[in-house]
Amino acid sequence: IPAPSIRLVPPYPSSQEDPIHIACMAPGNFPGANFTLYRGGQVVQLLQAPTDQRGVTFNLSGGSSKAPGGPFHCQYGVLGELNQSQLSDLSEPVNVSFPVPTW
């Protein structure tokens, strides 16, 4: 099943202490999916979309960006025929960067 879209939700972090908000959206025909957020292959958070909605927002507290590993990806799962769980492809990566200090 098709990959979700992924994007940073404003406000964008300006330091490692700022929270990070990441939205993941499934295609329109997959509402109520279960979403998993990964960083560098490690599970960061799981969220389920409401039954009438196709997206979630992961809210990560400040300092989450300090964790080692690669960029963020997300993936969703839905129940298919015979109640078998089907997983989507991984989303494109999203990188979190901070402005270079001016001092």
């Epitope: 404003p10 406000p11 700022d18 929270p19 909605q53 927002t57 809210n59 507290s61």
Partner: antibody, heavy 122, light 110 residues
Framework: QVTLKESGPALVTPTQNLTLTCTVS??????????WGWIRQPPGKGLEWIGS???????YYNPSLKSRVTISVDTSKNQFSLKLSSVTAADTAVYYC??????????????WGQGTLVTVSS | QSVLTQPPSVSGAPRQRVTISCSGS????????VNWYQHPPGKAPKLLIY???LLPSGVSDRFSGSKSGTSASLAISGLQSEDEADYYC???????????FGTGTKLTVL
């Protein structure tokens, strides 16, 4: 049911500082799903976003007001506050506090206070 | 000066349909989702539409939103007298790094 209520002076003298407080009831200000913001409406004009704060203290401000604005949060009292320095008559407005919810892949202001009219005059 | 432009006023007779436009640029509407708020006189603003076209629970399905490119629209069908209010589009502007509201549109039900 979440409610927000603004409190503070109705009249402020030019060049003074304005401080308003928003008290949140029926929900925790410390949730990771919300920002808490201030929006104003000068008489006969439209809505203008002033700035917002996260429970952790992270803030972001309207660039046109940034040099005069400070927003702070007191999680123990479930309150957040706006300080606007060196006010002028142009700061006369109805000031609203509001909750910004992060949900469903985006965000929106879902709960608003009733607003408080602040007049800047000598 | 707002970076989102709306018509100052629109009007319609009861049971008619009206639309309110909101014009922006790539840094706001073009790259970000749009919300719509209803602001009745003397009351607090109320969320009407979020994420371009989604309806919050409790809001009448007479209201609908759409977006194309750097413009968004709010449609109100079956106009009622209680719809009289100011309406604002809103989104995020990546250039300003902040929330922006439209100039506002006053709806009059004739």
């Amino acid at each position: 049911q979440v409610t927000l209520k603004e409190s503070g002076p109705a009249l402020v003298t030019p060049t003074q500082n304005l401080t308003l407080t928003c008290t949140v009831s029926g929900g925790s200000i410390s949730s990771s799903s919300y920002y808490w913001g201030w929006i104003r409406q000068p008489p006969g004009k439209g809505l203008e976003w002033i700035g917002s704060i996260y429970y952790s203290g992270s803030t972001y401000y309207n660039p046109s007001l940034k040099s005069r604005v400070t927003i702070s949060v007191d999680t123990s009292k479930n309150q957040f506050s706006l300080k606007l320095s060196s006010v002028t008559a142009a700061d006369t407005a109805v000031y609203y506090c509001a909750r910004r919810r992060n949900s469903s892949g985006w965000f929106y202001f879902d709960y608003w206070g009733q607003g408080t009219l602040v007049t800047v005059s000598s | 000066q707002s970076v989102l432009t709306q018509p100052p006023s629109v009007s319609g007779a009861p049971r008619q349909r009206v639309t309110i436009s909101c014009s922006g640029s790539r840094s706001n509407i073009g790259d970000n989702a749009v919300n719509w708020y209803q602001h009745p006189p003397g009351k607090a603003p109320k969320l009407l539409i979020y994420y371009d076209d989604l309806l919050p629970s409790g809001v009448s399905d007479r209201f609908s939103g759409s977006k194309s490119g750097t413009s968004a629209s709010l449609a109100i069908s079956g106009l009622q007298s209680e719809d009289e209010a100011d309406y604002y589009c809103a989104t995020w502007d990546d250039s300003l790094n902040g929330h922006v509201f439209g100039t506002g549109t006053k709806l009059t039900v004739l």
